[in-house]
């Protein structure tokens, strides 16, 4: 018997549903008694989903998992996996065993959109060119963890005095706190860039110095 | 099992460079962030650097080393590495490469042997 | 930056009692530490994470509790295999991720 599955990794957001696709190719005659069907977390090996002995033996993993019944005899063994969470990222394997067995391994990346950045100024009053002041972006609620750019208002990148920060949250997603400290010229436009690596999504904040008051 | 083995230590002058790399095997390396904690003779542990997962490349460092470190690695090989240039005496330290626990965990769940940074003139 | 202060800096006890050693962080971190132990000239282990979780093959008589600043590493009862140096870590806001100070548990 010979499995294939995905060769790309599967990318799911953040409470959705996702399925790792798993095939084989029955022979004329097969029969789901015949069919040893088991996924597992490749690095742990910890038991997510089994069908054995003719039936589906349900979820050993936070009950979030399902099999696809009535596609399985025309050799579907892809797995659903329900409510994404980013602790279910990783690489599964899916085992099949007929009357000999393979196996290959499928991989899950989590990802969730980061907010729109806000900006905040300090000091915020009494401005003047040749001050030092502190612009700090915040982006929530993302995953995986995000780059951060800073560019002037003619687009020039700003990598000095520039301290990112990451902190997940419970649910393991991660907010950026990003903070550029910038001499103040005569007017001009601060912009930072949050950007997602696996969805490749960009939220963008900017600030625009322009004497007073401050647009953001 | 999870193994980590760091190789390239040894001694050096000041100034001078060095290039740690840390075999990895018995996990899927490239679902891991990884990173690289040292602890100079009788001190305590300080982490030095993390890159995270699959290809993203997004890496962050210690200010003691930001500008003179670079981390790196090579999924298709399961090795990181570390590259030191501008080396100084208070680099000298076990250089241990580390495991994150997951990519938004960064607790160290496998550690390797460590491998020996001397920097003395 | 996140600063990990850990008590007492030594801990003298002999095999059998309990050792009850403190990590304090300077602002709060949730339930985003992990203790470690290292033996000399050996790579530390990871004991505890999520501040309550052993981690795999870790023994029961290894337990951590807290939350936020105030942090706990118990050791029901030493053996003598448990007599090494024990770092906090924390990973709620990074970088830097930071260490305590370590705590060493040695024979009385």
């Known amino acids: 018997v010979e499995v294939q599955v995905s060769e790309d990794p599967v990318v799911a957001l953040v409470d959705t549903d996702a399925t790792l696709r798993c095939s084989f190719s029955p022979e004329p005659g097969f029969s789901l008694a015949q069919l040893n069907l088991i996924w597992q977390l490749t690095d742990t090996k910890q038991l997510v989903h089994s069908f054995t002995e003719g039936r589906d033996q349900g979820s050993a993993y936070s009950n979030r998992t399902a099999l696809f019944p009535d596609l399985l005899v025309q050799g579907n063994a892809s797995l659903r996996l329900q409510r994404v969470r980013v602790t279910d990222e990783g690489s599964y394997t899916c085992f099949v065993s007929i009357q000999d067995f393979d196996s290959a391994a499928v991989s899950l990346q989590v990802a969730a959109p980061y907010s729109k950045p806000s900006m905040t100024l300090e000091p915020n009053k009494d401005l003047r060119p040749g001050n030092m002041v502190t612009i700090t972006c915040s982006s929530y609620q993302g995953y995986p963890e995000a780059e951060v750019f800073w560019k002037d208002g003619q687009g020039v990148p700003l990598t000095g005095n520039v301290t990112t920060s990451q902190m997940a949250n419970e649910r393991g997603l991660f907010d950026v706190h990003s903070v550029l400290r910038v001499v103040l010229g005569a007017n001009g436009t601060y912009s930072c860039l949050v950007r997602n690596p696996v969805l490749q999504q960009d939220a963008h904040g900017s600030v625009t110095i322009t004497g007073q008051p401050l647009t953001f | 099992d999870v193994q980590l083995v760091e190789s390239g230590g040894g001694v050096v002058r000041p100034g001078e460079s060095l290039r740690l790399s840390c075999a990895a095997s018995g996990f899927t390396f490239s679902n891991y962030a990884m990173n690289w904690v040292r602890q100079a003779p009788g001190e305590g542990l300080e982490w030095v650097s993390r890159i995270n997962y699959k290809g993203y490349n997004i890496t962050y460092y210690a200010d003691s080393v930001k500008g003179r470190f670079t981390i790196s690695r090579d999924n298709s090989k399961n090795t990181l590495y570390l590259q030191m240039n501008s080396l100084r005496a208070e680099d000298t330290a076990v250089y241990y490469c580390a495991k994150s626990g997951s990519n938004s965990n960064n607790f160290f769940d496998y550690w390797g042997l460590g491998t020996l940074v001397t920097v003395s003139s | 930056e996140i600063v990990l202060t850990q008590s007492p800096g030594t801990l003298s006890l002999s095999p059998g009692e309990r050792a009850t050693l403190s990590c304090r962080a300077s602002?709060?971190?949730?339930?985003?530490l992990a203790w470690y132990q290292q033996k000399p000239g050996q790579a530390p282990r990871l004991l505890i994470y999520g501040a309550a979780s052993r981690a795999t093959g870790i023994p029961a008589r290894f337990s951590g509790s807290g939350s936020g600043t105030e942090f706990t590493l118990t050791i029901s009862s030493l053996q003598s295999g448990d007599f090494a140096v024990y770092y906090c870590?924390?990973?709620?806001?990074?970088?830097?991720?930071?260490f305590g100070g370590g705590t060493k548990v040695e024979i009385k």
């Open positions: 602002q709060s971190i949730r339930s985003d």
């Open positions: 870590q924390q990973y709620n806001s990074w970088p830097p991720l930071t």
